[in-house]
């Protein structure tokens, strides 16, 4: 820092209060309005213009530097002159029904150009035709039900699956493995139409012509499909598209429930195996294969003409240099690209980030600096597979793994307006609990009460009484590369729906053209008080992480969850007591490692309490132990067949990218083990994974010991 630049020595708590008080709901509302006037699809000129606008505004807000980081990555777009659709054809090949080519535009947006029609990004081209099989949610267990129980072979069939429960890419992967030649994805009213609520524009429900867009990749953390492991810069070696990571091999297309009705009402074959296969349409939900009665000679045909194209994307990276530890980075990042207007996803998050930057900038202009450096990121191409964040992290991996303290994600601020939802590393549990005790609840009936109180009442932890639920990190968002690949402590927070009374997975209008500013302003958060609360939580976490003298991480909380996860995986294994005996499978090493970790974490905390915080070297040593603890759970070899998922305690579920799985290596080795052809080999892999987990926990414990 230049000598002329002042640094006000103001008590930290006062600065935190100043930072939080500076955050304004009205500003978030204004920013959201500004960000949602037009579509901002990744790789388009409009999204580049928005990147430059954000760069300019962050500079005005007072950040030290704001740069654009560009990459040339594989994206996917529909063919403008050759639209994608699905048809029912008769025995002569005549198209007797065609699905719609676009969503009816919402009021006020009829003349907006470049609204991308519904499509599943990265679908290959193709025009398959065949009999239809209804596969429910296309979960692993749904295909098990069809193949093993109903004895239905999906080979050579087109499957129709309803959106929900799991990431759409997993649905496509499951369909491919089952031998399907095409996939139709649709939004069922049972999942995307809440009872008693009107369709948009009169309410927040999905109309019959609404369709969810989304990518169908299975990247497993690779980033750009052509440059796995390395940034997609100008000198990058690019794979041939035939060798690209994670691309689907069969055509896939999404439709709304009006069009789905036309297909499903004709279905014959077997009745749905049980009530969990029935949705909300007035159709029998027969699984097929094929149509019934007068339609029995008709087939389904897909017409997919999308193109994959290497396209330039732009991240915006802003820096607020730390006054004391400029080489320690706290990152707040969220994406900017949207499928259409992005009313919720992502701009409700981007507007919050914008206001957080403005508040930090205001403090900086008054002479304050954070202790540690704060990096702010507006990621591009998240919707195409977390590409912007992953490419940037690949480019900066060496620095990040040495200097990265924490990453706080900032996608959609709301998916409902019921209560807070937090997913984070156990290291952040105490940070989140302490922060929410200091913040006001925005909820009706909780006036004058803390956010912690309303959150705890509405979403109590299933394990720890008196504490709110905090979930495991999975994936499907931009924290993935930071947490799962690099081992940087990460967290995310947003306002959510009541999961007990609402069974739909995402909000009904997710990734549709109806995700507009008006959706938020009219139905979800008219006063923007929930957005403000999310800004306070995200901003407050960043503030504490960047400004606390001792990092606000509690390693004892990791010890508690490690024991819980070890118990859970042991119980799964114990469903096979005979095999465990036959193959001498023991979890003793893992339980011993967890016990050791628990004891060492406890001793570490005792030393931390006695630490002379005025000794910068001793302080830095212990802070580094806390910072590097998450890193210690990284295995450089990665998980089997998933080299970019390297965290041994957590990984995205192999069956649902959105969900987190604990001890994923052991879990996957045990999954469906009773069906394995070679049980000796299968149980050998279980033993190998137990040993890896035990070693990793022991090694992580070792990093918390006194350094000498």
């Amino acid at each position: 820092k230049s000598p002329s630049e002042p640094t006000n020595i103001v008590p930290q708590h006062d600065m935190k209060k100043a930072f939080l008080d500076e955050l304004k709901a009205e500003n978030i509302k204004r920013f959201l309005y500004n960000f949602t006037r037009l579509p901002h699809l990744a790789g388009t000129e409009r999204n580049f213009q928005l990147a430059k606008q954000i760069q300019s505004q962050w500079k005005e807000f007072g950040l030290d530097s704001v740069e654009l980081a560009h990459y040339d990555v594989l994206l996917s777009y529909p063919n403008k002159t050759h639209p994608n659709y699905i048809s029912i054809i008769d025995e002569d090949g005549n198209e007797i029904f065609n699905s719609s080519l676009f969503e009816p535009p919402p009021p006020g947006y009829e003349n907006v150009s470049d609204v991308v029609p519904p499509f599943n990004a990265f679908s290959p081209q193709g025009m398959p035709e065949g009999d239809l099989v209804y596969v429910n949610y296309a979960q692993t267990e749904d295909f098990f039900k069809l193949e093993r129980d109903l004895k239905i072979n999906c080979s050579g069939k087109i499957v129709i699956a309803r959106y929900g429960k799991i990431f759409r890419g997993n649905k496509v992967k499951n369909a491919q493995l089952a031998g399907a030649k095409g996939v139709i994805l649709y939004s069922d009213p049972a999942d995307y139409f809440a009872p008693g609520v009107k369709s948009y524009p009169d309410g927040w429900n999905l109309p019959g012509g609404g369709v969810q867009r989304g990518n169908i990749l299975n990247l497993n953390g690779a980033g750009d499909p052509l440059t796995p492991g390395y940034p997609a810069n100008e000198y990058a070696y690019r794979r041939e598209v035939t060798e690209a990571v994670g691309l689907p091999s069969i055509p896939v297309h999404p439709i709304g429930y009006n069009d789905a009705q036309k297909l499903l009402e004709k279905m014959g074959g077997a009745a749905p195996p049980d009530s969990s296969w029935r949705g909300g349409l007035q159709v029998p939900y027969n699984v097929g294969p094929g149509f019934t009665g007068n339609s029995s000679t008709q087939k389904v045909k897909m017409h997919i003409h999308s193109n994959n194209k290497v396209t330039r994307i732009y991240n915006v990276i802003g820096t607020l240099r730390g006054a004391v530890e400029p080489d320690r980075y706290v990152i707040l990042g969220g994406h900017r690209d949207s499928w259409v207007f992005g009313g919720i996803d992502p701009q409700s998050g981007a507007a919050v980030v914008h206001e957080i930057v403005r508040s930090f900038g205001t403090l900086k202009k008054e002479g304050w600096r954070p202790r540690r450096t704060i990096l702010f990121a507006s990621w591009d191409a998240e919707e195409f597979g977390l590409l912007g964040s992953t490419e940037w992290a690949e480019e900066n991996s060496r620095v990040l793994q040495e200097r990265g303290v924490a990453y706080i994600n900032a996608d959609s601020s709301i998916e409902g307006n019921y209560t807070l939802r937090v997913d984070c590393t156990p290291l952040m549990y105490s940070l989140v609990y302490n922060l929410t005790k200091e913040l006001q609840s925005p909820d009706e009936g909780f006036e004058g009460k803390s956010l912690y109180e309303s959150w705890n009442e509405k979403s109590p932890s299933p394990e720890f009484s008196g504490m709110p639920r905090i979930s495991k990190l999975g994936s499907g968002n931009d924290f993935e590369v930071f947490f799962q690949r690099l081992g940087i402590s990460s967290g995310r927070a947003r306002y959510t729906k009541n999961w007990e009374t609402s069974k739909f997975r995402s909000y009904p209008l997710y990734h549709s053209v109806y995700e507009t500013y008006e959706l938020v302003e009219k139905f979800y958060d008219p006063t923007f008080k929930y957005h403000l609360t999310v800004a306070q939580v995200r901003g407050g976490m960043v503030f504490e992480l960047a400004n606390s003298i001792v990092l606000p991480f509690d390693c004892r909380d990791y010890a508690v969850v490690l024991r819980k996860y070890a118990d859970k995986i042991y119980n799964i294994s114990m469903k096979h007591p005979q095999e465990m005996k036959t193959y001498s499978v023991s979890f003793d090493s893992l339980f011993s490692a967890v016990k050791n970790f628990t004891e060492i974490a406890s001793k570490f905390n005792e030393r931390l309490e006695d630490l002379d915080k005025k000794n910068p070297i001793l302080l830095r040593i212990m802070n580094d132990q806390l910072m590097f603890l998450e890193r210690a759970f990284i295995d450089p070899l990665g998980l089997p067949d998933r080299p970019f998922y390297r965290h041994i305690i957590y990984a995205p579920s192999s069956h649902n990218k959105y969900a987190g799985e604990s001890f994923p290596g052991i879990y996957d080795a045990l999954f469906d083990i009773e069906s394995k052809v070679d049980p000796s080999k299968a149980w050998g892999e279980v033993k190998r994974q137990i040993s890896i987990a035990a070693f990793t926990v022991q090694a992580a414990a070792g990093t918390l010991r006194e350094v000498a």
Partner: antibody
């Protein structure tokens, strides 16, 4: 090998309830639909309902709706069928059958309803 | 409800005979139909599923055919252990229903 072992014969009074159990072994219990079927003396087989042991999803025959409840205990690999408000015409042999195509059957449980 | 009607209801035949049992559905069930064999005092056993696929362990003298509303079970050469009652059953729509049965007796 697959085995379904049902609980023993029951004699019940009209208006009472009966709960028949079906213990499965030799296969992955959660993978196969469990049906319940009954057969009155000299009559055809009559389907009552089914359950997906993995998620507890059930479907009941309209004829028995409100009177029959099918449940499972996954940890014990056991399915249960409870029939309430018994009447004399409910006297029958009750079978559990595993698999969508009724691949494997229990030995049957005779339920006699008599005052 | 879909009605299944089997014919004949009774059938007398001799060892070595070829016999055919028919099952008619009151509406189109595609190929969602199974055949079972039941002996007195015993539980039924699955013979054929999806109208024509032989269940594992079932002798190849049993075969099934048909789709829509007309189905047949054929035993190519009767063996002494085949004398029993045979049922068809549809799973195209709820409630799942069985035919009334065909009792195959020794002539």
């Amino acid at each position: 090998q697959v085995q379904l072992v049902q609980s023993g014969a029951e004699v019940k009074k009209p208006g009472a309830s009966v709960k028949v159990s079906c213990k499965a072994s030799g296969y992955t219990f959660t993978e196969y639909t469990m049906h319940w079927v009954r057969q009155a003396p000299g009559q055809r087989l009559e389907w009552m309902g089914n359950i997906n042991p993995n998620n507890g999803g059930t479907t009941y025959s309209q004829k028995f709706q409100g009177r029959v409840t099918i449940t499972v205990d996954k940890s014990a690999s056991t399915a249960y069928m409870e029939l309430s408000s018994l009447r004399s015409e409910d006297t029958a042999v009750y079978y559990c059958a595993a698999g969508w195509n009724f691949d494997y059957w229990g030995q049957g449980t005779l339920v006699t309803v008599s005052s | 409800d879909i009605q299944l009607t089997q014919s004949p209801s009774f059938l007398s035949a001799s060892v070595g005979d070829r016999v055919t049992i028919t099952c008619r559905a009151s509406q189109d069930v595609g190929t969602a139909l199974d055949w079972y064999q039941q002996k007195p005092g015993k539980a039924p056993k699955l013979l054929i599923y999806w109208a024509s696929t032989l269940h594992s362990g079932v002798p190849s003298r049993f075969s099934g055919s048909g789709s829509g509303t007309e189905f047949t079970l054929t035993i190519s050469s009767l063996q002494p252990e085949d004398f029993a009652t045979y049922y068809c059953q549809q799973y195209n729509s709820y409630p799942l229903t069985f035919g009334q049965g065909t009792k195959l007796e020794i002539k």
